[in-house]
């Protein structure tokens, strides 16, 4: 069985203010079972974006119907994006883990970029 | 609070069929899978059928697959199962249960009994 | 399959563990679900491997490794006298599978 890898295609993504940002990511496999998470920037300061498991996220919705038992698309739009939404947005697979879950693979990150709303 | 109510359950005799419905209330039921699962006088607890939050994705056991079809009308905030060719074997307590985020259970039902004999 | 032991007993406040075997630790999640009598509704005691619902009493636990899991209850109560049904659900193919379920009774 290939080991599973993540895949986000766009390396950057350009969108202006006010408007709604699509961040594609994609799984090659479901195993290890475990929930995705998505972060803006890297390391230990990285800020949680959407959590598969729980949380509640006004400004961010799934592309794909995440219930589907065979989705591999965790693709998320994020809403009214202001310059402080800039940044590299990294797509992270975990595997479960007791008591907490375990970093598996993360994608290559997309970098995104916010124009001034057009006048 | 979340509650799931089961009904549609009777006896009926062997090759009829059954409609079984389950209300939900207490939380958004169209951002969630469902499940039904049954249980037969003195056995243990059987998954039969599970349905994705937008109701596009169905999943069966094979001994139900073909006869039992799991659906869904997030505007009434009901799940269905449709039995086809019902034989005693299906006599069962039939529950609906709420899906986590991977597809196991937080919340039941009362369940529904559905008797099958001649 | 899952397989899980028949029965258990204890004495109240004693420690008990049931255990759940047969499932694949990267492709499954397991859960437990108690069943007080036959026919009544399941509650849900643990899902997520070791998750506890916010109105489950904390000397319920869950932890799964390898290709087993385990509900422990810590200081076991007359009132958990119950069935307890593990289930599992494989990522590899789509499917739910219960355990035949374990008589607990507390002495």
């Known amino acids: 069985e290939d080991e599973l890898q993540v895949i986000q295609p766009e390396k950057s993504v350009s969108v202006a203010a006010g408007e709604s940002a699509t961040l594609r990511c994609a799984m090659t496999s479901l195993i290890p079972v475990g929930p995705i998470m998505w972060f803006r920037g890297a390391g230990a300061g990285r800020e949680l974006i959407y959590n598969q498991k729980e949380g509640h996220f006004p400004r961010v919705t799934t592309v794909s119907e995440l219930t589907k038992r065979n989705n591999l698309d965790f693709s998320i739009s994020i809403s009214n994006i202001t310059p402080a939404d800039a940044g590299t947005y990294y797509c992270v697979k975990f595997r479960k883990g007791s008591p907490d879950d375990v970093e598996f693979k993360s994608g290559a990150g997309t970098e995104l970029s916010v124009r001034a709303k057009p006048s | 609070d979340v509650q799931l109510v089961e009904s549609g359950g009777g006896v009926v005799r062997p090759g009829e069929s059954l409609r079984l419905s389950c209300a939900a209330s207490?939380?958004?039921?169209?951002?969630?899978?469902m499940s039904w699962v049954r249980q037969a006088p003195g056995k243990g607890l059987e998954w039969l059928a599970g349905?994705?939050?937008?109701?596009?994705?169905?999943y069966y056991i094979d001994s139900v697959k073909g006869r039992f079809t799991i659906s869904r009308d997030n505007s009434k905030n009901s799940l269905y199962l449709q039995m086809n060719s019902l034989t005693a074997e299906d006599t069962a307590v039939y529950y609906c249960?709420?899906?986590?985020?991977?597809?196991?259970?937080?919340?039941w039902g009362l369940g529904t009994l559905v008797t099958v004999s001649s | 399959a899952l397989t899980q032991p028949a029965s258990v007993s204890a004495n109240p406040g004693e420690t008990v563990k049931i255990t759940c075997s047969g499932g694949d630790w990267y492709s499954t999640y397991y859960g437990w679900y108690q069943q007080k009598s036959p026919g009544s509704a399941p509650v849900t005691v643990i899902?997520?491997?070791?998750k506890r619902p916010s109105d489950i009493p904390s000397r319920f636990s869950g932890s799964a490794s390898g290709s087993a899991a385990t509900l422990t209850i810590t200081g076991v109560r007359v009132e958990d006298e119950a069935v307890y049904y593990c289930a599992g659900y494989d990522g590899r193919t789509y499917i739910n599978t219960f355990g035949a379920g374990t008589t607990l009774t507390v002495l």
């Open positions: 349905i994705s939050a937008g109701g596009s994705d169905t």
């Open positions: 207490g939380f958004t039921f169209s951002s969630y899978a």
């Open positions: 249960a709420r899906e986590t985020w991977n597809h196991l259970f937080d919340y």
């Open positions: 899902h997520s491997d070791d």
